[in-house]
């Protein structure tokens, strides 16, 4: 069985302020089991944008229905983009662990740039 890969097809995405940004991410396998998370930035200071397991992320919607048991699409849409949202977004697969899940594999990242709102 091939090892899971995390595919973020776009290196960069440009969105006008006030619009929604779609950040695409797909897995090549459902195994190992464990949640998907999205982060802005990398390293210790990265910001959690979305956690499949839990939490309230009012500006984030998932493009696919994550409750499908065979779902491999973990793309997200972030609404009402502002310049403060600019940065590189990483789709990260975790494998289950106890007490904490373990980071398994990250996508290559998608850089979000924000254009000025058209006048």
């Amino acid at each position: 069985e091939d090892e899971l890969q995390v595919i973020q097809p776009e290196k960069s995405v440009s969105v006008a302020a006030g619009e929604s940004a779609t950040l695409r991410c797909a897995m090549t396998s459902l195994i190992p089991v464990g949640p998907i998370m999205w982060f802005r930035g990398a390293g210790a200071g990265r910001e959690l944008i979305y956690n499949q397991k839990e939490g309230h992320f009012p500006r984030v919607t998932t493009v696919s229905e994550l409750t499908k048991r065979n779902n491999l699409d973990f793309s997200i849409s972030i609404s009402n983009i502002t310049p403060a949202d600019a940065g590189t977004y990483y789709c990260v697969k975790f494998r289950k662990g106890s007490p904490d899940d373990v980071e398994f594999k990250s996508g290559a990242g998608t850089e979000l740039s924000v254009r000025a709102k058209p006048s």
């Epitope: 459902l30 195994i31 190992p32 089991v33 949640p35 499949q52 397991k53 839990e54 229905e65 994550l66 409750t67 499908k68 048991r69 065979n70 494998r95 289950k96 106890s98 007490p99």
Partner: antibody, heavy 118, light 107 residues
Framework: DVQLVESGGGVVRPGESLRLSCAAS????????MSWVRQAPGKGLEWLAG????????YYIDSVKGRFTISRDNSKNSLYLQMNSLTAEDTAVYYC???????????WGLGTLVTVSS | ALTQPASVSANPGETVKITCSGG??????YGWYQQKSPGSAPVTVI????KRPSDIPSRFSGSASGSAATLTITGVRVEDEAVYFC???????????FGAGTTLTVL
């Protein structure tokens, strides 16, 4: 509080059909996958079927595939199980259950009893 | 198939461990379900291997390693007498399965 209330159970003859319902309240029903689980008298739990939050994807154990159909109406906060060609082996208490993000169960209904007897 | 002992017994205050084997660690999540009488509604005491719902006492804990999961009740009480079913979700097959149940008797 999360509440799941099953209804529609009863006594039927072999070969007949029955439709079970599960009324959900206390949570955003349309955001959760749901399942049906049954327990035959003196036996353990048996998962039967699951359905995604939007209702587009369904999953079944082999023994009920083709006979049972799981469905939902998110506008009515309701889950259903259509059971056809019933046999004595389908006699059980039927529970609806809310799924967690990883398809285990966190809340269960009180159950409804289905008896198949001639 | 998930395998668990048919019965366990303990005195009040003791620690009880119930094991459940049969799943592959990398494709399986486990849960534990308490049923106090046949035909009564099950109660989830553990899901996602080790996650305890907020209304479940802290004496219940869960773990998983290798091909097995364990439910631990630390300081068991008389009201914990019940049948405990382990359950699993397999990400390879998309199927849920249950063990046959373990009857816990508190002496």
């Amino acid at each position: 509080d999360v509440q799941l209330v099953e209804s529609g159970g009863g006594v039927v003859r072999p070969g007949e059909s029955l439709r079970l319902s599960c009324a959900a309240s206390g949570f955003t029903f349309s955001s959760y996958a749901m399942s049906w689980v049954r327990q035959a008298p003196g036996k353990g739990l048996e998962w039967l079927a699951g359905i995604s939050a939007g209702g587009s994807d369904t999953y079944y154990i082999d023994s009920v595939k083709g006979r049972f159909t799981i469905s939902r109406d998110n506008s009515k906060n309701s889950l259903y199980l259509q059971m056809n060609s019933l046999t004595a082996e389908d006699t059980a208490v039927y529970y609806c259950a809310r799924e967690t993000w990883n398809h285990l169960f966190d809340y269960w209904g009180l159950g409804t009893l289905v008896t198949v007897s001639s | 198939a998930l395998t668990q002992p048919a019965s366990v017994s303990a005195n009040p205050g003791e620690t009880v461990k119930i094991t459940c084997s049969g799943g592959d660690y990398y494709s399986t999540y486990y849960g534990w379900y308490q049923q106090k009488s046949p035909g009564s509604a099950p109660v989830t005491v553990i899901h996602s291997d080790d996650k305890r719902p907020s209304d479940i006492p802290s004496r219940f804990s869960g773990s998983a390693s290798g091909s097995a999961a364990t439910l631990t009740i630390t300081g068991v009480r008389v009201e914990d007498e019940a049948v405990y079913f382990c359950g699993a979700y397999d990400g390879r097959t998309y199927i849920n399965t249950f063990g046959a149940g373990t009857t816990l008797t508190v002496l």
